[in-house]
C-alpha cells in the first residue's frame, strides 16, 4: 500500500465545515476522517467544494463502505451523487422515497442520466412494484419516465398507480407500451361515469381494442382527431363509417385533412365509397359500389 501523507499539524478536521474548501486535495485526503464525513454528509451539500475535492470525499466514502453506502449516507449525498457511477449505485439498497426524491432533486432539469436510471431501477426492484407514490415522484421529475420502461416492466405497475399518470407522461409511449397500460387504466377508471371516464382514459386509447372503441362510439364522447390518429390501426379498421362518425362527433370533419395518413388512410380503403360519401367530406379511396368485400382472415380461419 502506498504510504499516505500525514496531516499537517493543526489541520485535522474536527467537523465538516467551510474551512475544508481551502484544503488542497492531499490535505483533504490526509486530514478528513471518513467516519466523520459519513456522519456529517448533510453538510457537504451546503459547502461549495470543487469537483476535484468532491472526488476526494467520494474516495474516502468508498474506502469506508466498500460494499456500498448505507442509506443514511446516500440520503445526504447531494451533489456528490453526480460523482457516482452506475456500478457504485448497484451496491446500494435504497428503500426510502425521501432518499430517492433527494437524489432526483440533484439531477433536476437534466436528462435522465445512467446514474439516475440505475438508482430508479434499484429502488423499484427493491419495492417489488411501481406503487402510486413512486410513480407520482418519478413522473414529476421525468414526465417521460413511464414510456422509458419496457412492456415487461410496465406489467408491474398496479392499476391503482394509473391515477398518478398525466397525459404528457404518455407522449412518447409506443403502441406496445400502451397495449400494457390501457387494460390497467380501464380497470382503474371503471367506476367513473361516461364523460369523466373518457377524459381519464383518452390518453391511454392507443392501446384500446376495436370492441372498446365501438362501445365508446355509443357514448357521445366526441374524440378529437389527435387522439384518433394515435389509435391502433388494427383496432380502427373494423369500425364502420357510422361508428367513426359517432366516435368523433363534430370532429369528424378533421378526417379530410388526415385522409393520407394512417390510420385514416387504411380505414378509408376498407369502407364502401357510398358509406364514406354520407359524411359529405369528399373522402376518396373507398371500395367502389358493387364490389364484393371478402374477409380473408375469416376465410383462412374456416379452411
Amino acid at each position: 500500500e502506498v504510504e499516505k501523507t500525514a496531516c499537517p499539524s493543526g489541520k485535522k478536521a474536527r467537523e465538516i465545515d467551510e474551512s475544508l474548501i481551502f484544503y488542497k486535495k492531499w490535505e483533504l485526503e490526509a486530514c478528513v476522517d471518513a467516519a466523520l464525513l459519513a456522519t456529517q454528509m448533510d453538510r457537504v451539500n451546503a459547502i461549495p467544494f470543487t469537483y476535484e475535492q468532491l472526488d476526494v470525499l467520494k474516495h474516502k466514502l468508498d474506502e469506508l463502505y466498500p460494499q456500498g453506502y448505507p442509506e443514511s449516507v446516500i440520503q445526504h449525498l447531494g451533489y456528490l451523487f453526480l460523482k457516482m457511477s452506475p456500478e457504485d449505485i448497484r451496491k446500494w439498497n435504497v428503500t426510502s422515497l425521501e432518499t430517492l426524491k433527494a437524489l432526483l432533486e440533484v439531477n433536476k432539469g437534466h436528462e435522465m442520466s445512467p446514474q439516475v436510471a440505475t438508482l430508479i431501477d434499484r429502488f423499484v426492484k427493491g419495492r417489488g412494484q411501481l406503487d402510486k407514490d413512486t410513480l407520482d415522484t418519478l413522473t414529476a421529475f421525468y414526465p417521460g419516465y413511464l414510456c422509458s420502461l419496457s412492456p415487461e416492466e410496465l406489467s408491474s405497475v398496479p392499476p391503482s398507480s394509473i391515477w398518478a399518470v398525466r397525459p404528457q407522461d404518455l407522449d412518447t409511449c409506443d403502441p406496445r407500451q400502451l397495449d400494457v397500460l390501457y387494460p390497467k387504466a380501464r380497470l382503474a377508471f371503471q367506476n367513473m361515469n361516461g364523460s369523466e371516464y373518457f377524459v381519464k382514459i383518452q390518453s391511454f386509447l392507443g392501446g384500446a381494442p376495436t370492441e372498446d372503441l365501438k362501445a365508446l362510439s355509443q357514448q357521445n364522447v366526441s374524440m378529437d382527431l389527435a387522439t384518433f390518429m394515435k389509435l391502433r390501426t388494427d383496432a380502427v379498421l373494423p369500425l364502420t363509417v357510422a361508428e367513426v362518425q359517432k366516435l368523433l362527433g363534430p370532429h369528424v370533419e378533421g378526417l379530410k385533412a388526415e385522409e393520407r395518413h394512417r390510420p385514416v388512410r387504411d380505414w378509408i380503403l376498407r369502407q364502401r365509397q357510398d358509406d364514406l360519401d354520407t359524411l359529405g367530406l369528399g373522402l376518396q379511396g373507398g371500395i367502389p359500389n358493387g364490389y364484393l368485400v371478402l374477409d380473408l382472415s375469416m376465410q383462412e380461419a374456416l379452411s
Epitope: G10, K11, D17, E18, S19, I21, F22, D42, R43, A46, I47, P48
Partner: antibody
Framework: EVQLLESGGGLVQPGGSLRLSCAAS????????MSWVRQAPGKGLEWVSG????????YYADSVRGRFTVSRDNSKNTLYLQMNSLRAEDTAVYYC?????????WGQGTLVTVSS | QSVLTQPPSASGTPGQRVTISCTGS????????VSWYQQLPGTAPKLLIY???KRPSGVPDRFSGSKSGTSASLAISGLRSEDEADYYC???????????FGGGTKVTVL
C-alpha cells in the same frame, strides 16, 4: 473560546485613509477564511471583503473595490483592512468575522466616521 | 436595495410562531447555503442558522431554518421577549463573487 477584536477605527476626513486590524484567538487562524462586514448607522449589514486562509484570492464588494485592500498575517493571527479614498458613505461600524460563506463568530466592531 | 429580499418587520405575541422569508435568485440562495443572523439592539450580529437549517450550539431549538429553490425562511416558535431583534439572511453570490445580505427584518414581541 473564539475571540475577534477590531481596532483602528476613528474619525477621518473624506479622501483620507485608515487601517483596521482584527486580532483573532481561540482557533487555528491560518485554517480559516476571514471577512469584513460593515453596518452604517441605522442601516443593515453590508459585506465588504473576504480573504481565504492563504490570501490567494481576495474578494471585495463593488462599493469598495479599488479603494480597500484586505490582508492577513497568519503568524500574528491578525486580519487587516486598508481603507483609502474614504467617503462619507463609508461611515459605519466595521466588524471582522470568521469564515467567508457563513460568519460563525463576529468581533464587537470598530466605528469609522468619515466627515469633514 | 438589498440583493436578498426580506420583509422589513414581523411581530407576534409571546408563545406565537413567527416566520421570516428571504428571497434571492439562482446565483445566491439557489446555489449556495443560507445563514441567518440575529442582532440584538446595540450588539454585534450572532450566527443563528448556518448551512440552511443547522443551529450552532447554544442556539435554542425554537429557531429553525429551511430552504427551497431560491427562497429561505427562518421560523421562531414559542416567541419570547428576548427574541426582539433584527434578523438578517445571508448567502454567497456566485455571480457577484461576494456575500450578500437581506435588508433585515425587525421582530417585535407584542
Amino acid at each position: 473560546e473564539v475571540q475577534l477584536l477590531e481596532s483602528g477605527g476613528g474619525l477621518v476626513q473624506p479622501g483620507g485613509s485608515l487601517r483596521l486590524s482584527c486580532a483573532a484567538s481561540g482557533f487555528t487562524f491560518s485554517n480559516y477564511a476571514m471577512s469584513w462586514v460593515r453596518q452604517a448607522p441605522g442601516k443593515g449589514l453590508e459585506w465588504v471583503s473576504g480573504i481565504p486562509p492563504d490570501s490567494g484570492s481576495k474578494y471585495y464588494a463593488d462599493s469598495v473595490r479599488g479603494r480597500f485592500t484586505v490582508s492577513r498575517d497568519n503568524s500574528k493571527n491578525t486580519l487587516y483592512l486598508q481603507m483609502n479614498s474614504l467617503r462619507a458613505e463609508d461611515t459605519a461600524v466595521y466588524y471582522c468575522a470568521k469564515n467567508m460563506f457563513s460568519f460563525d463568530y463576529w468581533g464587537q466592531g470598530t466605528l469609522v466616521t468619515v466627515s469633514s | 436595495q438589498s440583493v436578498l429580499t426580506q420583509p422589513p418587520s414581523a411581530s407576534g405575541t409571546p408563545g406565537q410562531r413567527v416566520t421570516i422569508s428571504c428571497t434571492g435568485s439562482s446565483s445566491n440562495i439557489g446555489s449556495n447555503a443560507v445563514s441567518w443572523y440575529q442582532q440584538l439592539p446595540g450588539t454585534a450580529p450572532k450566527l443563528l442558522i448556518y448551512y440552511n437549517s443547522k443551529r450552532p450550539s447554544g442556539v435554542p431549538d425554537r429557531f429553525s431554518g429551511s430552504k427551497s429553490g431560491t427562497s429561505a425562511s427562518l421560523a421562531i416558535s414559542g416567541l419570547r421577549s428576548e427574541d426582539e431583534a433584527d434578523y438578517y439572511c445571508g448567502s454567497w453570490d456566485s455571480s457577484l463573487n461576494g456575500y450578500v445580505f437581506g435588508g433585515g427584518t425587525k421582530v417585535t414581541v407584542l
